[in-house]
């Protein structure tokens, strides 16, 4: 697994460097997770032909994966920092069950899948420190998550491959949208 942010060789070589700001830490954390997603996708794409499927074909699924919408205040038009931050945190919390599902889906990249999951937890903590309105953040219901996990794990092999691909692709797009929004904060 790659070295977590803040622990790369450049940091070791430059101990007197200015500590990262909150925004820089968040930026670095998201980039780290996106690199992890790329590595996981290499394994899934080598194993199945899901990666050749068009976005439209993949959209025809019953997974309720978090997605940015106009009302979330993360886009340039109608941008709202607090509403957007709440959406990013809520979305990441909703992705956690899907990241848990990914844990047993990789052979050679098992460590990488764990690193993506753990780094996301850290990212949520970073963002919660930044948010002013923590009351607006709704945490997913553990019972609902548990039954969703059971349902996903009970799918046939083809559907599990499709689900894995969809989760990684959607998570990537959500993180990219988050990073674009955070660039304005």
């Amino acid at each position: 697994a790659p070295v977590p942010p803040g622990e790369d060789s450049k940091d070791v070589a430059a101990p007197h460097r200015q500590p990262l700001t909150s925004s820089e830490r968040i930026d670095k954390q998201i980039r780290y997770i996106l690199d992890g997603i790329s590595a996981l996708r290499k394994e899934t794409c080598n194993k199945s032909n899901m990666c050749e499927s068009s976005k439209e074909a993949l959209a025809e699924n019953n997974l309720n994966l978090p997605k940015m919408a106009e009302k979330d205040g993360c886009f340039q038009s109608g941008f709202n920092e607090e509403t957007c931050l709440v959406k990013i945190i809520t979305g990441l919390l909703e992705f956690e069950v899907y990241l848990e599902y990914l844990q047993n889906r990789f052979e050679s990249s098992e460590e990488q899948a764990r690193a993506v999951q753990m780094s996301t937890k850290v990212l949520i903590q970073f963002l919660q420190k930044k948010a002013k309105n923590l009351d607006a953040i709704t945490t997913p219901d553990p019972t609902t998550n548990a039954s969703l996990l059971t349902k996903l794990q009970a799918q046939n092999q083809w559907l599990q491959d499709m689900t894995t691909h969809l989760i990684l692709r959607s998570f990537k797009e959500f993180l990219q949208s988050s990073l674009r929004a955070l660039r304005q904060m």
Epitope: R31, K42, Q76, R169, R180, R183
Partner: antibody, heavy 124, light 108 residues
């Protein structure tokens, strides 16, 4: 050094499919994305679409129904296919490398190195 | 689709500084690129990711952004800077790009 080279037919008949290949060197397609841009004579450039380092595609909505972008990482090639061409598709077609940061933000149009371009004329 | 507005032409004397602006509602949340096209030549990146310069591009060229306006600044103008300059930024929602109408720079 980083290089991109477009290749394909210079003349395509109306209603046919325009197929171009971009061969890259000096970088890996699993580390950088590649985009396609065209410029009709005397006009402003137009972003067609791109493929990122994960193999995800992004298309100009106005051309999405006719456009297809694929890659072959083992050959370091990215291909563009534009169906049902008309005379308005006559342009210089460029492939270009997306900047490294573009992957993180999804800014796939943000390119740092260009190919020399290939003039494609659509005519019967 | 997003629209980017650039002045159609700008003229400045040799050795002077010039600023070319690019305005559009999407610039605030997206990276901006600046591309140079010398007469009869292909496109070349002068600035990418709003303010980064590719290797080989002189440091006389710089890029910046404030709100919904991006600016390309060229200091101590040289004759070889005479060209068309295009800006490009993101077209929100589809990760695609949109180009400005272009600015013709004339070095007097």
């Amino acid at each position: 050094q980083v290089q991109l080279q477009e290749s394909g037919p210079s003349l395509v008949k109306p209603s046919q499919t325009l197929s171009l290949t971009c061969t890259v060197s000096g970088f890996s397609l699993t580390s950088y994305g590649v985009g396609w841009v065209r410029q009709a004579p005397g006009k402003t450039p137009e972003w067609l679409g791109g493929i990122d380092r994960d193999g995800d595609m992004s298309y100009n909505p106005a051309l999405k129904s006719r456009l297809s972008i694929t890659r072959d990482t083992s050959k370091s090639q990215v291909s563009l296919s534009l169906r049902s061409v008309a005379t308005e598709d006559t342009a210089v077609y460029y492939c270009a490398r997306s900047s490294y940061d573009s992957h993180y933000y999804g800014d796939y149009y943000d390119v740092d190195v260009w190919g020399r371009g290939l003039l494609v004329t659509v005519s019967s | 689709q997003a629209v980017l507005t650039q002045p159609s032409s700008v003229s400045k004397s040799l050795g002077q500084s010039v600023s070319i602006t690019c305005s559009g509602s999407n610039i605030g949340s997206s990276a901006v690129g600046w591309y140079q096209q010398l007469p009869g030549s292909g496109l070349k990146t002068i600035i990418y990711s709003t303010s980064s310069r590719p290797s080989g591009v002189p440091d006389r060229f710089s890029g910046s952004k404030s709100g919904n306006t991006a600016t390309l600044t060229i200091s101590s103008l040289q004759a070889e800077d005479e060209a068309d300059y295009y800006c490009a930024t993101g077209d929100r929602g589809n990760y695609g790009g949109v180009f400005g109408s272009g600015t013709r720079l004339t070095v007097l």
